[in-house]
Interface confidence: medium
């Protein structure tokens, strides 16, 4: 069971300081941006982190949304990352959900975050380069200190 707590507006960056945004095709990508670029590209660079109470405490449960024309929420259905046109619900009556991730700080690095899927244990949001694009993907954690699954989250409220 997950119960919605509160939401906050955030900018999410990978450890190369690239900013996460949602492109015109609703794809979550990372790109180098100045602070000015970041503001100019809002709301595509501003993510709503919806915090949830978890009935089985496993970390801070979150759903990640973005509001462009409509609200879309990040999903990892079938281990594929996509934004689905939906509002994060107030309550989710299950212990797993494709839209719920556990946000935890990296041990020894309180300002660095990682997001583990509640549906696929051991799978984390990650940044991966594919040709000339830096994509947000779901990746099985396979090594200690993997920088690709670490992010910084900047509160924009």
């Amino acid at each position: 069971y997950f119960g919605k707590l509160e939401s906050k507006l955030s900018i999410i960056r990978n450890l190369n300081d690239q900013v996460l945004f949602i492109d015109q095709g609703n794809r979550p990508l990372f790109e180098d941006m100045t602070d000015s670029d970041c503001r100019d590209n809002a709301p595509r660079t501003i993510f709503i982190i919806n915090m949830y109470k978890d009935s089985q405490p496993r970390g801070m449960a979150v759903a990640i949304s973005v509001k462009c024309e409509k609200i879309s929420t990040l999903s990892c259905e079938n281990r594929i990352i996509s934004f689905k046109e939906m509002n994060p619900p107030d309550n989710i009556k299950d212990t797993k959900s494709d839209i719920i991730f556990f946000q935890r700080s990296v041990p020894g690095h309180d300002n660095k975050m990682q997001f583990e899927s509640s549906s696929y244990e051991g799978y984390f949001l990650a940044c991966e380069k594919e040709r000339d694009l830096y994509k947000l993907i779901l990746k099985k954690k396979d090594e200690l200190g993997d920088r690709s699954i670490m992010f910084t989250v900047q509160n924009e409220d």
Partner: antibody
Framework: EVQLVESGGGLVQPGGSMRLSCTAS????????MSWVRQAPGKGLEWVSG????????YYADSVEGRFTISRDNSKNTLYLQMNSLRAEDTAVYYC?????????????WGQGTLVTVSS | QSALTQPASVSGSPGQSITISCTGT?????????VSWYQQHPGKAPKLLIY???HRPSGVSDRFSGSKSGNTASLTISGLQAEDEADYYC???????????FGTGTKLTVL
């Protein structure tokens, strides 16, 4: 200017009921989770209850679970706390506050508080 | 859920630095980065000084700073001023049923 104004406090007998209201202005009320925090005379702060933006997520401290009910009316920009089966230990100044979990770069906002006295 | 543990009182002279500790468990302070610090003057509502362990809201003096190590969070006030005399409370998200917990409070006296 952000304002939170609590009302509804006063004197009530043990076992009685009371409803507190908190009227918000100066911000988009339905975009924020809200909470109630209380402070007994001369004592520390105690988180009482919180509610999500849409009102579907409601949470309580163990000390008030089953006796208090938090709710909100976003059309009226108002937060409520219905308090039943009141006890002497519920005597406190009750504050409404936003936000209540993560804090925010723009700070947070508290009402001036309303005093609830439970006594015979 | 027990309150987080803070020293009942601390004191310092103007210009000095003081640190207030806030000790919890791995279910609250140690497990999450949702630790806040509040200042409360007598008869007034609390004011947020620090959120998410070490972030300062706009308008809060940079003399106030927050940190965390393990299950203990700390608030440091540098260059103490007379107006810093107040009660200070930490708070944290908790995975217990109570969801959110405050510290016991610390009275700061500026000598």
């Amino acid at each position: 200017e952000v304002q939170l104004v609590e009302s509804g406090g006063g004197l009530v007998q043990p076992g009685g009921s009371m409803r507190l209201s908190c009227t918000a202005s100066g911000f988009t009320f339905d975009e924020y989770a809200m909470s109630w925090v209380r402070q007994a005379p001369g004592k520390g702060l105690e988180w009482v209850s919180g509610i999500s933006t849409g009102g579907g997520g409601t949470y309580y401290a163990d000390s008030v679970e089953g006796r208090f009910t938090i709710s909100r009316d976003n059309s009226k920009n108002t937060l409520y706390l219905q308090m039943n089966s009141l006890r002497a230990e519920d005597t406190a100044v009750y504050y409404c506050a936003k936000p209540w979990l993560s804090g925010s770069r723009s700070g947070d906002f508290w009402g001036q508080g309303t005093l609830v006295t439970v006594s015979s | 859920q027990s309150a987080l543990t803070q020293p009942a009182s601390v004191s310092g002279s103007p210009g000095q630095s003081i640190t207030i500790s806030c000790t919890g468990t791995s279910s609250d302070v140690g497990g999450y980065n949702y630790v806040s610090w509040y200042q409360q003057h007598p008869g007034k509502a609390p004011k947020l000084l620090i959120y998410e362990v070490s972030h300062r809201p706009s308008g809060v003096s940079d003399r106030f700073s927050g940190s965390k190590s393990g299950n203990t969070a700390s608030l440091t006030i540098s260059g103490l001023q007379a107006e810093d005399e107040a009660d200070y409370y930490c708070s944290s998200f908790t995975s217990s049923s109570s969801l959110y917990v405050f510290g016991t409070g610390t009275k700061l006296t500026v000598l």
